[in-house]
């Protein structure tokens, strides 16, 4: 039950995270005009990964796409790549994890297969989250560098007669969305990896076999090292064996150490 909950929660958290990464990637407010200590401009500038926008005080907003590929800064291209890789990995991870969910039965898929799929999706979510966090952090670092450069210019470039309004950019809402979303995807991935441990059978490729002893009955379960003898311990008529060999799937399972997370 705990494994299912952990897996389900990991899936939901990752889903929210990836939705956030997609939202952040599409958002226009990666960098916004710094209004602190600036004259009250009747124009507000903000930029995204794909276009830059200007919101006039009149209420009209005009956005222009970056229609060049070669003319863009390498850092911006790198951020775009990281975010897209994060989205693609996250989307594949979501697809894989849907089939890996314990609460969903697909044919006669074994727990070992579900465990492997859960681990795969978990790793994908972790990498996806790291890509998003890295992308947002690279962009943030770029902003900080440019901010201090333009601040220096504001105080050194005042030699001329004509003053110029120095537009400085600060962190936009998309950066915070990206950081949170990346973190959620990462947490979701870790939860999936933890759930995977609980899904994996402790011993595979062995059958649980009941052996008939002539004097008294002993039910031997490989791996568990638990034997129940017939000497008075079955006073309440508990069924220890029914004469045949059963697989681990068919036998009522004992709580394993991985069930409590």
């Amino acid at each position: 039950m705990a494994v299912t909950a952990c897996q389900g929660l990991g899936f939901v958290v990752s889903l929210i995270g990836i939705a956030g990464i997609i939202a952040a990637t599409c958002m226009d407010q990666w960098s916004t005009q710094d209004l602190y200590n600036n004259p009250v401009t009747a124009v507000f500038n903000y930029q995204g990964l794909w276009r830059s926008c200007v919101r006039e005080s009149s209420g009209f907003t005009e956005c222009r796409g970056y229609f060049t590929l070669l003319g863009l800064p390498a850092m911006l291209q790198a951020v775009r790549a990281l975010m897209i890789v994060g989205i693609v990995l996250g989307a594949i991870g979501l697809l894989v994890s849907i089939f890996a969910l314990k609460c969903i039965r697909i044919g006669s898929m074994e727990d070992s297969a579900k465990a492997n799929m859960t681990l795969t999706s978990g790793i994908m979510f972790i990498v996806s989250g790291l890509c998003a966090i890295a992308g947002v952090s690279v962009f943030a670092n770029m902003l900080v560098t440019n901010f201090w450069m333009s601040t220096a210019n504001m105080y050194t470039g005042m030699g001329g007669m004509v003053q110029t309004v120095q537009t400085r950019y600060t962190f936009g809402a998309a950066l915070f969305v990206g950081w949170v979303a990346g973190g959620l995807t990462l947490i979701g991935g870790v939860m999936m990896c933890i759930a995977c441990r609980g899904l994996a059978p402790e011993e595979t490729n062995y059958k649980a076999v009941s052996y008939h002893a002539s004097g008294h009955s002993v039910a031997y379960k490989p791996g568990g090292f638990k034997a129940s003898t017939g000497f008075g311990s079955n006073t309440k008529n508990k069924k220890i064996y029914d004469g045949g060999a059963r697989t681990e799937d068919e036998v009522q399972s004992y709580p394993s150490k991985h069930d409590y997370v």
């Epitope: 005009q33 500038n45 830059s52 005080s57 009149s58 209420g59 222009r64």
Partner: antibody, heavy 118, light 113 residues
Framework: DVQLVESGGGLVQPGGSRKLSCAAS????????MHWVRQAPEKGLEWVAY????????YYADTVKGRFTISRDNPKNTLFLQMTSLRSEDTAMYFC???????????WGQGTLVTVSA | DIVMTQSPSSLTVTTGEKVSMSCKSS????????????LTWYQQKPGQPPKLLIY???TRESGVPDRFTGSGSGTDFTLTISSVQAEDLAVYYC?????????FGAGTKLELK
């Protein structure tokens, strides 16, 4: 057709108060920022105040800050300018204007004359 | 505050003549975000409210005759009337639309010779 009609002007004593109104029609008033601009007799244009479509932010010229208050009633399609502590230099024709692309004023009212005199 | 300086203060012209007037701002009105200069030109005839002619320094408002042309960027701007008509006799104002307060120039009066 866009129409802006100012009212409320007249003769006021120095230190007195007056409230100007601007009735808008022919456009979605609640979607546009609005301004008050004044023009002293035989003088140039002077920007007075701005109010955004949602009533925030609001900006004033330094010459009227603390004395004039701009407001709007979107359901009634009306812009207001409450003027207090009036001085003789506030004597002017007061125009309301609609904010447009390029932060320009595309439509102006005919104006209402405010005369501050003893 | 941004100071807008218009020159000349008055111009005497004959109909059909080409005329230019200047407007200079104390600070750049150029916005890098959209590569536009936030300067507007208005025409005001006696007893009338101002009329919008040009915004973004060079974009003509709809309905404005194409003999009116705005040019310039940053701090130096020009309004040109390619062939002055009798109905163009008015006062022309430039306005800073970039930084509050949105200041106006003192105006250039166009008069008939």
């Amino acid at each position: 057709d866009v129409q802006l009609v100012e009212s409320g002007g007249g003769l006021v004593q120095p230190g007195g108060s007056r409230k100007l109104s601007c009735a808008a029609s022919g456009f979605t008033f609640s979607s546009f920022g609005m301004h008050w601009v004044r023009q002293a007799p035989e003088k140039g244009l002077e920007w007075v105040a701005y109010i955004s479509s949602g009533s925030s932010p609001i900006y004033y010229a330094d010459t009227v800050k603390g004395r004039f208050t701009i407001s709007r009633d979107n359901p009634k399609n009306t812009l207001f300018l409450q003027m207090t502590s009036l001085r003789s230099e506030d004597t002017a024709m007061y125009f309301c204007a609609r904010f447009y692309y390029g932060n320009s004023f595309d439509h102006w009212g005919q104006g209402t004359l405010v005369t501050v005199s003893a | 505050d941004i100071v807008m300086t218009q020159s000349p203060s008055s111009l005497t012209v004959t109909t059909g003549e080409k005329v230019s007037m200047s407007c200079k701002s104390s600070q750049s009105l150029f916005n890098r975000g959209n590569q536009k200069s936030y300067l507007t030109w208005y025409q005001q005839k006696p007893g009338q409210p101002p009329k919008l002619l040009i915004y973004w320094a060079s974009t003509r408002e709809s309905g404005v005759p194409d003999r009116f042309t705005g040019s310039g960027s940053g701090t130096d701007f020009t309004l040109t009337i390619s062939s002055v008509q009798a109905e163009d006799l008015a006062v022309y104002y430039c306005q800073n639309n970039y930084i509050y307060p949105l200041t106006f120039g003192a105006g250039t009066k166009l008069e008939l010779k």
